[in-house]
Interface confidence: medium
């Protein structure tokens, strides 16, 4: 499984990711159990975060991992939990935030110099899939899809942002994780009020690039809380 690969330090030796832009299905998006995706303004945020159930890390966002919410808890009840920052304890790579990996039980910085920042996502615009596109094999050995192309380029399937080339991050698209461009100044970003609220979202945006942060656009300050437009702006 992917988890077993993430558990090892072989993460840096991944074969070229699968290629692919994921699609964005239908207007009405819902998550069982009974969660309806918010409609209306496409820059809405979700105020009331509901824990997102999961079975594998790949079903969570790129800044989350799948685990039992309580230490030693029932393994059958797992949710997406916020990733662990540098120097925090870990058991596998997926537990560490983008740009870090698990080494000797501690999250440490990846060798590659990748952009920092939270993964930005959009609620109603598109789909992201856990794109495991691995027909039951370890990612180290066999990738079953026919969509091989150069490692890390835009559209390639990825596990973490460190799998993508510079200027790209790994974000969900129609239930697949693919390399997408890091956001530039002026581009729309998504700022979640609650960590992990992306559990209800299909498509993710990348985070803002170096020297930029996701802030409310100045002329949108008067807008209602739910429709404030955020863009990448200089610090």
């Amino acid at each position: 499984t992917l988890n077993s690969v993430l558990n090892s330090n072989a993460i840096k030796n991944l074969p070229p990711p699968l290629g692919g832009a994921a699609g964005h299905p239908g207007s009405a998006v819902s998550a069982a159990p009974g969660i309806l995706y918010p409609g209306g303004n496409k820059y809405q945020t979700i105020d009331n975060y509901q824990p997102y159930p999961c079975a594998e890390d790949e079903e969570c966002g790129t800044d989350e991992y799948c685990a039992s919410p309580t230490r030693g808890g029932d393994a059958g009840v797992q949710i997406c939990l916020a990733c662990r920052k540098r120097r925090k304890r870990c058991m596998r790579h997926a537990m560490c935030c983008p740009g870090n990996y698990c080494k000797n039980g501690i999250c440490v910085s990846s060798d590659q110099n990748h952009f920092r920042g939270e993964i930005e996502e959009t609620i109603t615009e598109s789909f992201g899939n856990d794109h495991s596109t691995l027909d039951g094999y370890s990612r180290r050995t066999t990738l079953s899809s026919k969509m091989y192309h150069t490692k890390g380029q835009e559209g390639s399937v990825c596990l973490r942002s460190s799998d993508c080339a510079s200027g790209l991050c790994c974000a969900r698209h129609f239930w697949s994780k693919i390399c997408k461009p890091v956001l530039k100044e002026g581009q729309v970003c998504t700022k979640h009020r609650r960590k992990g609220s992306h559990g209800l979202e299909i498509f993710q945006r990348c985070y803002c690039g170096e020297g930029l942060s996701c802030r409310i656009q100045k002329d949108h300050h008067q807008a209602s809380n739910s429709s404030r437009l955020h863009t990448c702006q200089r610090h």
């Epitope: 699968l18 290629g19 699609g23 299905p25 615009e125 598109s126 239930w175």
Partner: antibody
Amino acid sequence: EVQLLESGGGLVQPGGSLRLSCAASGFTFNKYPMMWVRQAPGKGLEWVGAIQQRGLKTAYADSVKGRFTISRDNSKNTLYLQMNSLRAEDTAVYYCARWTSGLDYWGQGTLVTVSS
Amino acid sequence: DIQMTQSPSSLSASVGDRVTITCRASQSVDRYFNWYQQKPGKAPKLLIYSASFLYSGVPSRFSGSGSGTDFTLTISSLQPEDFATYYCSQSTHVPLTFGQGTKVEIK
């Protein structure tokens, strides 16, 4: 070899119901999102909806929202499309397809005719 | 919904001809864009994904280009088996939408 085989199509009266099935083989079904796409006679392709790998999430086109339900049984490698309150404009060949970075494998399609 | 406008709706060409089909989206779809080929009575087949990447097994005479709103499918030298209907599709926004199709016929 990857194969998708739809079944369950046929003639149904307006307002009626039908359940389509799509039997998958040759790949690890539970690793892929799946979609339904339809094509009215002599017309183009229309996306119907999609379902996430574990069936936790679904999405639908406005034209079928509230009437159609997509589900999957990963233990049986089968995708379903439950169609209720059928209308004449739902007449089409219905295809199930596997999603990767595009719809890379399609079934042969099953014809649904809604007519009185 | 994003509207996909394909042109031309049909064209006649000869074997060996260079054929270009264009597709315009009503708003930007980045590069999350696919091309499909469909022959009468058959299911569509994926040709190009992510705007320009050739799907495995597809002959190299097919190529895709474009980003944003304008995309192109080119067949460098038309072969007898290429006479079919071609559809573009965006996968950047919900719902996934297709162009109306371009039928490539024998001149």
